[in-house]
């Protein structure tokens, strides 16, 4: 999968989206890593 | 309301460095990664590198290491980008980006900041 | 790195126009394909982003498709504030790449 920093800002978006916001505050693209997903 | 705000214009001479800055507001702005990206008169888009402002984390354009440098300042929500040994082909619009997902999912660019390289 | 090659480089077209951009990647991309809007003296705007996905306030007559090497970015209707030139961009490697632009002017 794609791990450049814009790919991750954009599957953590779309996670994001599906959950409805209800994700952990921390949960940012700067503190993700690609393997998180 | 999002902003980035980059600084004023520079004429330097070959040889020199320069150093832009992009302020950001409306934002949390560890949370977002931070693009640079350059224009020459009449050319294309090209990518000059991108920072983690949270851990200070750089990616660079090979095409750029060693010449730019990819900095930011925490506390003051600011982003900047260094370029060094200019040459008169670095004459160009530099631009900061970030897409941020937190208040409003898009792609948002600063002003840009005209860096004239001439003797 | 990573190609991007748009075409066509420029065009004319009326308002209501449907008008189509391509762009081909050398490489497999993906969907990790945007595209932007540049006006003269303006910063770029975006408009999609994984190929097909509109941001926000981007209004509908704008399309993106494809997947892999080649992506399309259609204005089903052409409108005045539409004349611009447009770019693509993949960020599925880096270094990221940007396309060489399409011109898009009144006939």
């Known amino acids: 999968a794609c791990d450049t920093a814009t790919c991750v800002t954009h599957r953590l978006a779309g996670l994001l989206s599906r959950s409805g916001g209800v994700v952990k505050n921390n949960f940012v693209p700067t503190n993700v890593g690609s393997k998180a997903f | 309301e999002v902003q980035l705000v980059q600084s004023g214009a520079e004429v330097k001479k070959p040889g020199a460095s320069v150093k832009v800055s992009c302020k950001a507001s409306?934002?949390?702005?560890?949370?977002?990664?931070m693009n640079w990206v350059r224009q020459a008169p009449g050319q294309r888009l090209e990518w000059i590198g991108d920072?983690?402002?949270?851990?200070?984390?750089?990616n660079y354009n090979q095409k750029f290491k060693g010449r730019a440098t990819l900095t930011v300042d925490k506390s003051a929500s600011t982003a900047y980008m260094e370029l060094s040994s200019l040459r008169s082909e670095d004459t160009a619009v530099y631009y900061c980006?970030?897409?941020?997902?937190?208040?409003?999912?898009?792609?948002?660019w600063g002003q840009g900041t005209t860096v004239t390289v001439s003797s | 790195d990573i190609q991007m090659t748009q075409s066509p480089s420029s065009l004319s077209a009326s308002v209501g126009d449907r008008v189509t951009i391509t762009c081909k990647a050398s490489q497999n991309v993906d969907t990790n394909v945007a595209w932007f809007q540049q006006k003269p003296g303006k910063s770029p705007k975006a408009l999609i982003y994984?190929?097909?996905y509109r941001y926000s306030g981007v209004p509908s007559r704008f399309s993106g498709s494809g997947s892999g090497t080649d992506f399309t970015l259609t204005i089903s209707s052409l409108q005045p504030e539409d004349f611009a030139t447009y770019y693509c961009q993949q960020y599925n490697n880096y270094p990221y790449t940007f396309g060489g632009g399409t011109k898009v002017e009144i006939k």
């Open positions: 994984s190929a097909s």
């Open positions: 409306g934002y949390t702005f560890t949370d977002y990664y």
């Open positions: 980006a970030s897409i941020i997902i937190v208040p409003n999912y898009f792609d948002y």
């Open positions: 920072i983690n402002p949270n851990t200070g984390g750089t």
